[in-house]
Interface confidence: medium
């Protein structure tokens, strides 16, 4: 149980001390005080680093001293022969003799008190950010106007997050900008476009002033600018290292600045906008887009007509054509959808004729009706070639979709008669 | 056929055999036969049969036999109530559509139409090709295909002949330009039997092909001049007979 | 940047059999018709092979059918061209070619010599 | 099949002038299907023209298509050096066989 004060005395004190002993003594203040340690009796057989009998006064790991000997006080006014002073609230004191004492030796008496330490200026860290406030037991960190104090409640920051930036049009600079920024904060800014808009960032080199990168290239204070996985930065330095515009593909963007304690610059400033979310020109083979632009954007639309001997399959309907809007996640909606080719189905068979099984029966694909020879022959012309025409039909050039027409050949007889001379 | 050689089908592959009555006719087209009028006026559901060199009944079980739909006698034969003493053959000509389409092939294919030009017009001496399974001079009638090969003759030739058995007057019988009259040659002729079949002449802008200049139809005496209808006076009714009765498939 | 590279040509004699392959990258290799033209030492272009983009359907020269098996395996974004029974007249430049709008043949390959030659 | 027939087969000319190239089909062939390839020496062909009039990426203005039905024509308003080579017509609409014409040869003067 911690105690504002104490005495210490070795054993038989003020009897001579028995040989081997070691005895220890575990004194602790209560929190936010230090201890005062002094000792007014000194007698412990002298050696070398007393290394025969001592009394030992540790802090933690550290030693703090280790005595041995007679002392007397060097102040006619005070019977301290020997203090310690620790700013720390616990405090360990150990005794030793060895196994002989040539004389007879009395050891010693000590005092501690709890004594209050000036965190603010006893420690190399500075505890606090900004102000630093010293009390009796403790100490509180205080902050300069326009400054809060962060949850550790040491740090002072600026207020600088929460903003969210909704317009499509906008301009967002850091805290006092041009002035220098804050130090010691984390700035937050939100930008929540409409789906279908993606934010575009913009710079100018001129307006980006932040503290540079250490020697390993990590900087110190940085600019990260974050759309869904995709991130940007972090970016330091004098001009703005990153791309003038930053074509975020998505509407929503996080930025995010981050300073230290020390080097405040001017800071940053940045316009940005909502661009309709483009959509690429994508792969359709055989057809036109209509309308033809070199950029497609958020909510445009595009029929999408397939070439002559080409159709849009969609369930058991061909179509020529069909439409495409860019959606707001950057795709062409209907973006299975394909012109294939219009295929004629398997060609009609004729009466005293053929068709040889066609290769394909795709559009451009070419058959050929052919009628029995020698017994037939093709009646109304065209040659019997056909080809897949853009309509799904199998043509001819001269008779169009109407199927060729086999007729007997007439007049010809197989062998010749002659005449039998009698 | 009187003074003919044997011939086989596929000399004339359009020659169709009627077996009642005993007759000819030639095959146009896969839906139409042409013949003579006198061979179908009294029978209008004729037996027929094509692919075949031979009438023999057994070559006729395995050869082609072709059904009547209907028969077309042209309207200008004068139909008689006693056939048998007709003296008046002019129109000798009618058609048979059939129910099934005929298949074609070495031994069954059609013989052409005369066209309506000039060319077609016979000059004496033309010589046309005949065939049937007619009186010979042997039989009354030839199990196997006979074929000969005749000139052209003026009408008068035919006038000029005694009528063998005349049934009237010889100048009952009655001659017209719808006749053609051919013959006279060693003794080569058509007889009964034969009537219907084709008088084939030669294609005068295709030489490969014959066409049907003729039908055998009737004649004062066997072995001398024989008279035959001359298609080509008909070859508009006929063509308007075959399209107002095709099915549309046809068309 | 759309790219074809074809592989496996080579010397064989007559009668014998190579199979040349077309490596597509840079474009959807299923969305297109692809197709396989020759060109004989110091002459014109001859189309070989079409192969529509899902593979159902090939069309070939009529000097080759029977002979030569147009295929695609689009997991592998590649086109094959197995050619057996070759003759001397085979003796070309094979080259692998994209067909886009009206099947015009966009994207080449560098081409890959066959020589057939006892 | 359609025969596309290319004259001249050789054309020889000098840059400045103007060319003119003829592609003509055996039968009809619908304009969509009708191409033109440029090839250079020891390279492979390139696109150069499709569906008969439009141009190919990267492909200069002063070249131009035109055409229908069986005749066709690639013209070069004004030749420059580069543009010596051979050019070679394509259908692809009436299949198999796609064909390609023969080839015009264009040479400087």
């Known amino acids: 149980e911690p105690t504002m004060y104490g005495e210490i005395l070795s054993p038989n004190y003020p009897q001579a001390y028995p040989s081997e002993v070691e005895k220890s003594w575990d004194i602790e203040v209560p929190e936010g005080y230090g201890i005062h340690l002094y000792f007014t009796h000194l007698d412990i057989e002298l050696s070398e680093n007393c290394a025969y009998d001592s009394v030992q006064i540790i802090s933690g790991d550290t030693e703090e001293g280790r005595l041995c000997g007679q002392r007397s006080s060097n102040n006619p006014h005070s019977p301290i022969v020997e203090e310690f002073q620790v700013p720390y609230n616990k405090l360990q004191v150990i005794f030793k003799s060895d196994f002989s004492n040539e004389e007879r030796f009395t050891g010693f008496a000590a005092y501690y008190v709890a004594t209050d330490i000036n965190e603010c200026t006893d420690f190399v860290d500075v505890p606090c950010s900004h102000f630093c406030n010293n009390f009796i037991g403790g100490y509180f960190c205080s902050c300069p106007p326009e400054y809060f104090l962060h949850d550790d409640m040491k740090n002072c920051g600026v207020n600088c997050s929460g903003d969210v930036f909704t317009a499509l049009i906008g301009e967002i600079a850091s805290p006092n900008y041009p002035k220098p920024y804050p130090e010691n904060s984390r700035c937050e800014y939100q930008i929540r476009l409409e789906k279908g808009f993606q934010v575009v960032v913009t710079l100018r080199r001129e307006d980006f002033d932040v503290e540079a990168a250490d020697s390993a290239g990590n900087c110190l204070d940085s600019l990260v600018f974050v759309a869904g996985d995709r991130q940007f930065g972090p970016y330091c330095g004098h001009g703005f290292p990153g791309p003038l515009n930053i074509e975020t593909k998505s509407n929503a963007l996080d930025i995010i600045f981050q300073t230290d304690l020390t080097g405040q610059k001017k800071g940053w400033k940045l316009r940005y906008h909502g661009d309709p979310m483009p959509c690429p020109k994508e792969d359709t083979p055989n057809s036109v887009w209509e309308p033809a632009k070199a950029k497609y954007v958020f909510r445009d639309v595009v029929q999408i007509t397939c070439l002559d001997g080409f159709e849009v399959v969609e369930g058991r309907v061909g179509a020529t054509s069909f439409y495409s809007t860019c959606q707001s996640n950057g795709k062409w909606s209907n973006s299975k959808l394909k012109c294939q080719p219009v295929d004629c189905g398997i060609p009609e068979s004729i009466e005293n004729g053929k068709v040889e099984d066609p290769e394909s029966t795709l559009f451009g694909s070419v058959i050929r009706y052919t009628c029995e020879e020698p017994y037939y022959y093709m009646e109304n012309g065209g040659g019997g070639e056909y080809h897949c025409a853009g309509n799904g039909s199998w043509v001819n050039e001269v008779l169009g979709p109407e199927l060729p027409k086999c007729v007997p050949v007439c007049g010809v007889p197989r062998e010749p008669f002659e005449e039998k001379q009698r | 056929i009187i003074g003919g050689s044997d011939a086989d089908i596929k000399n004339f592959p359009w020659q169709v055999f009627f077996d009642n009555p005993w007759a000819g006719g030639a095959l146009i087209n896969e839906y139409w036969v042409l013949t003579a009028a006198h061979v179908v006026e009294g029978n209008r559901e004729p037996t027929m049969y094509v692919g075949s060199t031979s009438v023999q009944t057994s070559r006729l079980a395995k050869s082609k036999m072709l059904t009547p739909e209907h028969v077309f006698i042209h309207p200008g034969w004068k139909l008689l109530e006693v056939p048998e003493g007709r003296t008046n053959f002019d129109n000798d000509i009618a058609l048979v559509r059939l129910k099934d389409p005929v298949k074609m092939g070495p031994t069954v294919s059609p013989i052409c139409l005369p066209g309506t030009s000039s060319d077609y017009n016979l000059m004496d001496g033309d010589l046309g090709l005949i065939s049937g399974w007619g009186r010979t001079e042997k039989r009354d009638r030839a199990v196997r295909l006979k074929a000969a090969r005749l000139p052209v003759a003026p009408l008068r030739k035919c006038k000029e002949v005694k009528v063998e058995k005349p049934t009237a007057d010889a100048e009952a019988y009655v001659f017209t330009p719808n006749m053609i009259c051919a013959g006279g040659e060693k003794g080569m002729d058509s007889c009964k039997g034969d009537s219907g079949g084709a008088f084939a002449v030669q294609d005068p802008n295709d030489k490969t092909k014959f066409y049907a200049a003729g039908l055998v139809s009737w004649g004062p005496q066997c072995g001398t001049y024989g008279l035959y209808t001359r298609v080509k006076n008909y070859v508009d009714w006929i063509m308007k007979t075959m399209q107002e009765n095709s099915t549309p498939r046809e068309d | 940047e759309v790219m074809l590279v074809e592989s496996g040509g080579g010397l064989v004699k007559p009668g014998g059999s190579l199979r040349l392959s077309c490596a597509a990258s840079g474009f959807t290799f299923s969305n297109y018709a692809m197709s396989w033209v020759r060109q004989a030492p110091g002459k014109g272009l001859e189309w070989v092979a079409t192969?529509?983009?899902?593979?159902?359907?090939?069309y070939y020269l009529d000097s080759v059918k029977g002979r030569f098996t147009i295929s695609r395996d689009n997991s592998k974004d590649t086109l094959y061209l197995q050619m057996n029974s070759l003759r001397a007249e085979d003796t070309a430049l094979y080259y692998c070619?994209?067909?886009?709008?009206?099947?015009?043949?966009?994207?080449w390959g560098q081409g890959t010599l066959v020589t057939v030659s006892s | 099949q359609i025969v596309l027939t290319q004259s001249p087969a050789t054309l020889s000319l000098s840059p400045g002038e103007r060319a003119t190239l003829s592609c003509t089909a055996s039968s009809s062939v619908s304009s969509s299907y009708l191409h033109w390839y440029q090839q250079k020496p020891g390279k492979a062909p390139k696109l150069w023209i499709y569906?008969?009039?439009n141009l190919a990426s990267g492909v200069p203005s002063r070249f131009s298509g035109s055409g229908s039905g069986t005749d066709y024509t690639l013209t070069i308003s004004s030749l420059q050096p580069e543009d010596f080579a051979t050019y070679y017509c394509h259908q692809y609409y009436r299949h198999p066989p796609i064909t390609f014409g023969q080839g015009t040869k264009l040479e400087i003067k």
């Open positions: 569906s008969t009039s």
């Open positions: 192969i529509s983009s899902g593979g159902s359907h090939t």
């Open positions: 070619a994209r067909l886009f709008t009206g099947y015009a043949m966009d994207y």
